[in-house]
């Protein structure tokens, strides 16, 4: 009986034309949605001007429908068992199921002149840029629409940049009608232990954002993993969000709609400094705002994201040092809220229900040639927005799932 | 040693262009912007503008905007400034000068404008 | 524009006297003040940059003090060599602007 399952299942999750694996695999069943909370600034006069404590107040959700598109340009390689695929993205915003609408303004940190003064670090440099943000009447904070602030929005210092930079601005600029990708991933056809495991990504076998171990593509996407999941393995996966692979521990059983699932959460460890963590040394790439590598729960991207200063970390800076959070009043962190998990269908390897959360933060520094930075006295890793992409399997889905998979174990 | 090498003196016409290069050694040219200074005859120093050879970025005095060209080679390490539309009173010494704090100077080139 | 006034035009010292040179600002510019020498034929010579940080191989008896709108550039000890033009920058913002500069001359 457990072997003719075993082979059932092995058929089945292999990601080629025919199977159940793959018809969910290239358009996913369940409904994705990404809520953002965005964190209003509500003192940027006095902290511009008296470099006080940053004091936000989270506003949302703000909802949006995502993953709805099927990958594209999906191309199995018989010779080296593995499938490649684009993976295009598109966001529709849910009015129902969001506090307010896209018009709705914020008040957040200048992006363009954060980013700018630090990739610039010149001092002339520095004092153009000043010029042009005195002429266009920019500040180190601006009021933006919750659209302008994900989406792009035409920024009117580096409109007057005279030579060729992207006026365009916004956190996941560009978005709608582009691709993460190419990945290609092992089908499992050979191995199945080695199912949807990435092979390579744009080419690659390594990122080219960081030293040694920290630079590899570990693992899957963390849609799905190998079958016949124990809950003593470390489940690896990679990121494009967070421009690095990171992995999750057991936590616990959880019965998901009458199936019983692994959860799977990140620890608290993969966010350590290397004091704590060794492995995590290649994840500090600079001494000044890390205090030499002892900071820990944030993750400079810069490298990644053309110089711009952006740090990711967990809602709230969650598991992240006192000093990250210290120039921050409002955080109230909290693991249930905050933390990201993976519920795992054991046998398929399948992800039946998420909660993947990050927050995007950007890094400002005290400018003594640019005016509305000049009063800084210290560096602020500032929180715009942090989010929640959930994904839970149908309740159609989910008894499929019992009478074919789980109810037939049992 | 550090050291900026400015081309010859020059004799031009009203209405023509002039343009003088200075040369830098002893240094990385990208690392450091080139300020660009003159001085008329028995005048004060005047800031006309500066390029950084890195990033390409340039600022020029209101005065000058329009009639003077900065640019920078890299490759060869030569910073050079043109001046269009020359008049009587563009009669100067034209320096090049390193950095924000003019740390380093050419020797100065001469630039007489006369019918 | 950050407008530099320096003053006196012209002064007159003796080998061994102390002299000051004043710029003032119009708008505040910290301490970014740099303070020149230039003799007859030559490129001026940076003596003394932002912060009052005397150059590498600039004599002790040259200083600077000052902050905001505020400077003063102090010669103790005069000496012969001495005699010169020096002229203050302002470096915080765009455009760079000098003072009209000093004639000191030694007696």
């Known amino acids: 009986g457990d072997l003719l399952i075993q082979k059932t299942i092995k058929k089945q999750v292999v990601l080629e034309e025919g199977t159940i694996a793959f018809k969910n695999w290239v358009k996913t069943g369940t409904e994705v949605y990404r809520q953002f909370w965005i964190f209003d600034v509500q003192n940027p006069q006095e902290v511009m001007m008296n470099s006080s404590n940053i004091q936000v107040k989270q506003r949302g959700p703000y909802t949006y429908r995502v993953r709805f598109l099927a990958k594209e340009n999906v191309t199995q390689d018989a010779e080296d068992n593995t499938v490649s695929f684009l993976q295009p993205n598109g966001a529709i915003f849910e009015p129902s199921l969001s506090v307010g609408t896209e018009a709705d303004n914020f008040t957040v940190l200048n992006l363009a002149v954060a980013a700018a003064s630090h990739i610039y670090q010149n001092q002339f440099v520095q004092m153009i840029l000043n010029s042009l943000i005195n002429k266009s009447k920019s500040s180190m904070f601006q009021v933006r629409t919750l659209r302008e602030l994900l989406w792009g929005y035409r920024d009117p210092f580096l409109s007057l940049v005279p030579y060729p930079v992207t006026t365009t601005v916004g956190l996941f600029y560009p978005y709608n009608n582009t691709a993460d990708g190419v990945y290609k991933v092992f089908n499992g056809k050979d191995n199945i232990s080695k199912v949807a495991i990435i092979d390579t990504y744009k080419g690659k076998r390594n990122l080219s954002y960081w030293e040694s171990h920290c630079d590899m593509i570990n693992g899957t996407d963390a849609a799905s993993f190998p079958p016949f999941v124990e809950k003593s393995q470390v489940l690896q996966f990679f990121s494009s969000d967070i421009c690095r692979s990171i992995y999750a521990v057991f936590e616990s059983d959880v019965n998901l709609k009458g199936i019983p699932v692994y959860r799977f959460v990140l620890p608290s460890k993969a966010f350590a400094s290397p004091v704590e963590n060794p492995d995590n040394y290649c994840f500090c790439t600079e001494k000044i705002i890390s205090k030499n590598c002892t900071s820990y729960g944030v993750l400079d991207i810069s490298k990644c994201k053309e110089g711009r200063p952006v740090y990711i970390s967990l809602p709230h800076f969650l598991y992240a040092s006192p000093d990250v959070s210290e120039p921050i009043d409002g955080l109230n962190p909290n693991e249930e809220e905050h933390r990201t998990y993976l519920d795992i269908e054991p046998i398929t390897g399948f992800t039946l229900q998420f909660a993947k959360r990050l927050q995007v933060n950007l890094l400002v520094k005290p400018s003594e040639k640019i005016q509305v930075l000049k009063n800084l006295k210290r560096n602020y890793i500032v929180p715009i927005l942090w989010l929640n992409e959930t994904g839970t399997i149908g309740d159609e889905k989910a008894n499929m799932f019992r009478s074919q998979v789980t109810g037939k174990i049992n | 040693e550090v050291q900026l090498v400015q081309s010859g003196a020059e004799v031009k016409k009203p209405g023509s262009s002039v343009k003088v290069s200075c040369k830098a050694s002893g240094y990385r040219f990208s690392d450091y912007e080139m300020q660009w200074v003159r001085q008329a005859p028995g005048q004060g120093l005047e800031w006309m503008g500066g390029i950084d050879p890195e990033t390409g970025g340039i600022a020029y005095a209101q005065k000058f905007q329009g009639r003077v060209t900065l640019t920078a080679d890299k490759s060869t390490s030569t910073a050079y400034m043109e001046l269009s539309s020359l008049r009587s009173e563009d009669t100067a010494v034209y320096y090049c000068?390193?950095?924000?704090?003019?740390?380093?100077w050419g020797q100065g080139t001469l630039v007489t404008v006369s019918s | 524009e950050t407008t530099v006034t320096q003053s006196p035009a012209f002064m007159s010292a003796t080998p061994g006297d102390k002299v000051t040179i004043s710029c003032i600002t119009s708008?505040?510019?910290?301490?970014?003040m740099n303070w020149y020498q230039q003799k007859p034929g030559e490129p001026p010579k940076l003596l003394i940059s932002?912060?009052?940080t005397l150059r590498p191989g600039v004599p002790s008896r040259f200083s600077s003090s000052g902050y905001g709108t505020d400077f003063t550039f102090t010669i103790n000890n005069i000496e012969s060599e001495d005699a010169a033009y020096y002229y203050c920058?302002?470096?915080?913002?765009?455009?760079?602007?000098f003072g009209q500069g000093t004639k000191l001359e030694i007696k």
């Open positions: 708008t505040d510019i910290d301490d970014d």
């Open positions: 000068t390193r950095k924000l704090d003019f740390d380093y």
């Open positions: 920058l302002q470096s915080d913002n765009l455009p760079l602007t």
């Open positions: 932002e912060g009052s």
